[in-house]
Interface confidence: medium
């Protein structure tokens, strides 16, 4: 058993059919030491008396808010939270595998340039009786700061018959240099609570290879004379790093077609602007991916041919 | 990045020009080297991330771009200030700083070089002769050397009379090449800076 | 001991706003992890979950009827409300409310209030 | 919203028999999953919570079982007083369902 916060314990069981349990000792936070009776979840049943309370802890039934009472007056709580292991492995009901990029994803994480700032996020259909908490730090055995707000719900999407909700947190590095070469991972670890069940998530990785540029800015056509060529000019998003001839990017610029079926044109470019033939009903997207480290292309920022 | 990409005119500033190809060449030795080894610990998550360079060059604190100089955390370490010689400058645009932080880099290929030689000769002798160094990788290396034109005494190749432990060579080759790859990223940025002032 | 305990109009016509209130006795909305929820039952037929409301004043409403729920409470009376506005004959049912603890089942029921609707 | 489908509709028993009602979660509902008890003229009474566990004060004859989308509700030896119509719910998402109910009639 282990503290989660101020009077909230998590109990880590074996979960297997007659699993024996865990013997958890809860003691009165109280300088009482006669008269004190326990009861769990407000229910009026006297569990026993005494200044500590003896419980066996086997299921979901035996966790929940213990609470000591003196003369009709409560003197402490004590929430009791079961985190379970199946076959040695930690339970994920909580949380959707998000599956990409591999198996057993379940947050997800990005970085719009090199300042030490990423958000995650992370998917689960249940709707109620949910709490998060993130804590974040560069590298385990000697931890360096990170800094994560809260975890707010930040989409619901309808999947078939499913509803999913998304979360994401923001986080930055207490001290980043955005030209640091990286050689300890940033960790991030989630606490999960649905109702009485406790699951943790972690996820590991360096900021370089979750970096996704914001699509670029300003992307404007200007036709050339007596051709049906047109120049793409676009600028470096503003939230990329700088100065930006240290931090590059490189450009993708596609032609396509109004039907999906049509061929596309793409050219790769390190300049910020283009030459391309513009079709008519076509359009012209330019997305951007950092020049020496290929982490994701970010988005496409598109602009009609007409 | 094997798109048809459009480069800058190397002819301003030839250094540049060789480190977009050490990036490149060191990118696809490390490809090669993930699919080749693909049951050894070969991944960035896998591996351990070590620079052999730490506390013996100090490139990304000399390299350091000016605009990031007023950044704190970016400070930490330096006891030197910005940014250069050798032949990629003009003699004009020469600074001390600059000279410090190309000297850093001519230091990180110089060792990398040898460590690389190194263990080429080992993975020579591995009977199932399973993965070896690119050449175009150690012939980059050595343009750009070439190209930075620093004079230093050649360091003599590490020889070891005993067996090697291929299986420990071949992690410790994943190893070199994911930092090295990480260096070459570092050395690629600070080239282009150098080539727009 | 907990108690909880409906009362309405008894009858209304259509279109008219149903409100409902729950008194109950034996735990307190000031508490963390107690909520209170209501709950319908036609007659002869199933239950329907309403809405339910967390001792933060978290709220949520089943979506099918949302735009015409509103639950409220007044922790200090330990009275909780239901309005359901432009009723018509299909809400006619046996209203509960029900105490929704930490084990997240009704663990407690009001006897329930009967509601009809006509005109 | 989850649809919990509750069978059987109907069960006629006698005393001593055993019975066992299922209700199957349109989609996985971990294991927040009630059973609850309603006699004639009487508010729904809680039985097991948590799929499996019994609430206080409930005869050890009730008892449930499963998992995600199935699950098993059995009164190993049917007493009269078991008169009711018993009813699954899942308060793992909201909207918070039932299923439609087990009448339960003793021969």
């Known amino acids: 058993i282990w503290e989660l916060k101020k009077d909230v314990y998590v109990v880590e069981l074996d979960w297997y059919p007659d699993a024996p349990g865990e013997m958890v000792v809860l003691t009165c936070d109280t300088p009482e030491e006669d008269g004190i009776t326990w009861t769990l979840d407000q229910s009026s049943e006297v569990l026993g008396s005494g200044k500590t309370l003896t419980i066996q802890v086997k299921e979901f039934g035996d966790a929940g808010q213990y609470t000591c009472h003196k003369g009709g007056e409560v003197l402490s709580h004590s929430l009791l939270l079961l985190h379970k292991k199946e076959d040695g492995i930690w339970s994920t009901d909580i949380l959707k595998d998000q599956k990409e990029p591999k198996n057993k994803t379940f947050l997800r994480c990005e970085a719009k340039n090199y300042s030490g700032r990423f958000t995650c996020w992370w998917l689960t259909t249940i709707s109620t009786d949910l709490t998060f908490s993130v804590k974040s730090s560069r590298g385990s055995s000697d931890p360096q700061g990170v800094t994560c707000g809260a975890a707010t719900l930040s989409a619901e999407r309808v999947r078939g018959d499913n509803k999913e909700y998304e979360y994401s947190v923001e986080c930055q590095e207490d001290s980043a240099c955005p030209a640091a070469e990286e050689s300890l991972p940033i960790e991030v670890m989630v606490d999960a609570v649905h109702k009485l069940k406790y699951e943790n998530y972690t996820s590991s990785f360096f900021i370089r290879d979750i970096i996704k540029p914001d699509p670029p800015k300003n992307l404007q056509l200007k036709p050339l004379k007596n051709s049906r060529q047109v120049e793409v000019s676009w600028e470096y998003p503003d939230t990329w790093s700088t100065p930006h001839s240290y931090f590059s990017l490189t450009f993708c610029v596609q032609v396509q077609g109004k039907s999906k079926r049509e061929k596309k044109d793409r050219v790769f470019t390190d300049k910020t602007s283009a030459t391309v033939i513009c079709r008519k009903n076509a359009s012209i997207s330019v997305r951007a991916q950092d020049r020496y480290y290929s982490s994701s292309w970010s988005e496409w920022a598109s602009v009609p041919c007409s | 990045r094997n798109l048809p990409v459009a480069t800058p005119d190397p002819g301003m500033f030839p250094c540049l020009h060789h480190s977009q190809n050490l990036l490149r060449a060191v990118s696809n030795m490390l490809q090669k080297a993930r699919q080749t080894l693909e049951f050894y610990p070969c991944t960035s998550e896998e591996i351990d991330h070590e620079d052999i360079t730490k506390d013996k060059t100090s490139t990304v604190e000399a390299c350091l771009p000016l605009e990031l100089t007023k950044n704190e955390s970016c400070l930490n370490s330096r006891e030197t200030s910005f940014i250069t010689n050798g032949s990629c400058l003009a003699s004009r645009k020469t600074s001390f700083m600059m000279a410090l932080c190309l000297s850093s880099i001519y230091e990180d290929l110089k060792m990398y070089q040898v460590e690389f030689k190194t263990m080429n000769a080992k993975l020579l002798m591995d009977p199932k002769r399973q993965i070896f160094l690119d050449q175009n990788m150690l012939a980059v290396i050595d343009e750009l050397m070439q190209a930075l034109n620093f004079n230093s005494e050649t360091v003599p190749q590490k020889s070891s009379l005993e067996e090697p432990d291929f299986y420990k060579t071949k992690i410790k080759l994943c190893i070199l090449l994911h930092a090295f790859r990480i260096r070459a990223v570092t050395i690629d940025r600070v080239m282009s800076y150098l080539n727009a002032s | 001991q907990v108690t909880l305990k409906e009362s309405g109009p008894g009858i209304l016509q259509p279109s008219q706003t149903l409100s409902l209130t729950c008194s109950f006795s034996g735990f307190s909305l000031r508490k963390s992890v107690m909520g209170v929820s209501w709950i319908r039952q036609p007659s002869g037929k199933g239950l329907e979950w309403l809405a339910h409301?967390?001792?933060?004043?978290?709220?949520y409403y089943n979506p099918s009827l949302k735009s015409r729920l509103t639950i409220s409470k007044d922790p200090s009376r330990n009275q909780v409300f239901l309005k359901i506005t432009s009723v018509d004959t299909a809400d006619a049912a046996t209203y509960y409310c029900?105490?929704?603890?930490?084990?997240?089942?009704?663990?407690?029921w009001g006897q329930g209030t009967s509601v009809t609707v006509s005109s | 919203s989850v649809v919990m489908t509750q069978t059987p509709k109907f069960l006629l028993v006698s005393a001593g028999d055993r019975v066992t009602i299922t209700c199957k979660a349109s989609q996985s509902v971990s294991n927040d999953v009630a059973w609850y008890q309603q006699k004639p003229g009487q508010s729904p009474k809680l039985l097991i919570y948590y799929a499996s566990n019994r609430y206080t004060g409930v005869p050890d004859r009730f008892t449930g079982s499963g998992y995600g989308t199935d699950f098993t509700f059995i009164i190993s030896t049917v007493r009269a007083e078991d008169l009711a119509v018993y009813f699954c719910q899942q308060d793992y998402n909201s909207p918070w369902t039932f299923g439609g109910g087990t009448k339960l009639e003793i021969k």
């Open positions: 029900t105490r929704r603890g930490i084990r997240s089942a009704m663990d407690y």
């Open positions: 409301i967390y001792w933060d004043d978290d709220k």
